[in-house]
């Protein structure tokens, strides 16, 4: 880790790089940007893959916690021999199979796309690349764009979840690293604590859940507190109100002492949670107390 | 519970064209990634991917059919149509329909045996 | 398109582990499923993207996929698992799926 601020939400970060023949020259500035971006992410829970795409997209590093694989992935990536066209779509799709899947298993860990590309996409390669984004969308991703030099901001911010979701590098790739710390705040999703931890058991409670990145969300209204109750049932609660670094929610009723309550949130309704290692527990209050 | 089920002709002749329907239940073509594909399956011999339609009506090909095959969907009746042309009697199979995404099929339907005789 | 090469036929010993490959230029940059086909049945799905194992498939049945190769693992393997085995894969530059020539498991 080199300092700096970091990331300690729990999802599925995927990134789409492109590797076509435009950014031969630059793969390094490329490589670089997302290793220093990689390791901010640093909860045991976050899964990472890297994709690339040119004339057709590769799965260099299928989603993993284990950070040695990542940093295998990150040596496989400083490899790359960029070459080809633009087809940014071939790497949404990849990003789509993965969370395709991943939903599949019953629990939907949130996924979170960041999208890097160089040039303007032409005319089909615009409309499939947004049709691609779209799908990962209805699978439940958050998606961001770097565009670095010669993109197009408007192709851009149709195809992220929207134009605050874009990242222009107007200055070329040695820029790059200059909006790690600003992608880094904008594209994560933390919870850092609730407060009360601990609650009585039979009673009702608001808990103010304290992370960041909150108000991210495409729509704040599809934002939900989510509470695994004992590793099995999961109840959602719609948040009395949600601001960038903190929820105020109704918490379930927990009616036994010990009961222990993982804490997630959903930033579209349910469809995906990230998680957290902040736990709310019961215990015994007497009247009065 | 999700269920597929082909239907279509037992015999068909050569140089005829042959018209399958998979009638489904328990599911839906409009969740994203969801798609059904065909696979038949010669008697004694491996399997052989046909042909995939999705929601938004992508449709994929085998590459050594491609000219024969069309599939087609619809969506109100949970029916995919798949159609095939000049029949041979090497074309003799079962064939199945079946739910998938990416390549992997989770339901299949139980299969129905085409003979091109004539 | 890609080719999954798989070996014609695998022997197990009930209670021993059976291993059977799907070999493919590339193949773990892919995702691998593999099939389960008893005589005169439709097949079945016991492993999907790699590793994956749907819901009331054993816990025997495992995958992985590395380097070339793909495998499909049955640990403490039974008399009723015998059957075809056959792994497909999706070749996305040309948007088709690719089955392997299957592989028949006996159990002695």
């Known amino acids: 880790e080199d300092g700096g601020p970091a990331c300690y939400g729990g999802f599925d970060l995927y990134f789409i790089l492109d590797k076509s023949g435009s950014v031969l020259h630059h793969w390094n500035e490329i490589y670089y940007f997302v290793e220093q971006l990689a390791h901010k992410f640093i909860s045991p829970q976050l899964r990472m893959s890297f994709i690339v795409f040119s004339t057709r997209g590769t799965t260099l590093m299928k989603l993993t916690e284990d950070r040695e694989q990542i940093r295998q992935g990150l040596e496989e990536l400083q490899k790359v021999l960029p070459g080809g066209d633009t087809y940014m779509h071939e790497g949404f799709e990849r990003a789509s199979e993965q969370i395709y899947y991943e939903n599949r298993q019953g629990y939907r860990t949130a996924s979170v796309i960041i999208a890097l590309t160089d040039g303007e996409l032409h005319e089909d390669l615009f409309f499939y690349s947004e049709r691609e984004a779209n799908r990962s969308r209805d699978l439940g991703a958050i998606v961001y764009c770097v565009g670095v030099k010669d993109f197009n901001e408007t192709q851009l911010a149709r195809i992220a979840d929207s134009k605050d979701h874009v990242f222009p590098v107007n200055d070329g790739f040695q820029a790059l690293q200059g909006i790690i710390h600003s992608i880094l705040k904008k594209s994560c999703i933390e919870i850092l604590a609730a407060e009360p931890s601990t609650i009585c058991a039979g009673e009702s409670f608001q808990v103010v859940v304290r992370g960041n990145g909150f108000r991210h969300a495409r729509n704040v209204d599809r934002v939900l507190c989510s509470f695994k109750i004992n590793d099995s049932v999961t109840l959602n609660e719609k948040p009395f109100s949600v601001e960038d670094t903190y929820l105020l929610c109704p918490a379930p009723i927990l009616k036994e002492v010990g009961m222990k309550a993982a804490l997630q949130v959903s930033m579209n309704d349910g469809l995906s949670f990230i998680s957290s290692s902040v736990i709310i527990t019961t215990t015994h209050c007497s009247d009065g107390s | 519970q999700v269920q597929l089920k082909e239907s279509g002709p037992a015999l068909v002749k050569p140089t005829q064209t042959l018209t399958l329907t998979c009638t489904f239940s328990?599911?839906?073509?409009?969740?994203?990634?969801?798609?059904v594909s065909w696979i038949r399956q010669p008697p004694g011999k491996a399997l052989e991917w046909l042909a995939h339609i999705n929601l938004d009506d992508d449709k994929y090909y085998s590459t050594s059919l491609k000219t024969r095959l069309t599939i087609s969907k619809d969506t109100s009746k949970n029916q995919v149509v798949l159609t095939m042309t000049n029949m041979d009697p090497v074309d003799t199979a079962t064939y199945y329909c079946?739910?998938?995404?990416?390549?992997?099929?989770?339901?299949w339907g139980q299969g129905t045996l085409v003979t091109v005789s004539s | 398109d890609i080719e999954l090469t798989q070996p014609p036929s695998v022997s197990v010993a009930p209670g021993q582990t059976a291993r059977i490959s799907c070999s493919g230029d590339?193949?773990?940059?892919?995702?691998v499923h593999w099939y389960q086909q008893k005589p005169g049945q439709a097949p079945v799905l016991v492993i999907y993207?790699?590793?994956k194992r749907p819901s009331g498939i054993p816990e025997r049945f495992s995958g992985s996929n590395s380097g070339n190769t793909a495998t499909l693992t049955i640990s403490g393997t039974q008399a009723e698992d015998e059957a075809d085995y056959y792994c497909?894969?999706?070749?996305?530059?040309?948007?088709?799926?690719?089955f392997g020539g299957g592989t028949k498991l006996t159990v002695l």
């Open positions: 993207a790699d590793n």
């Open positions: 497909s894969s999706y070749d996305y530059n040309a948007h088709l799926v690719v």
């Open positions: 079946a739910r998938g995404g990416y390549g992997d099929m989770d339901v």
């Open positions: 590339n193949i773990r940059s892919m995702f």
């Open positions: 328990g599911f839906s073509l409009s969740t994203s990634g969801m798609g």
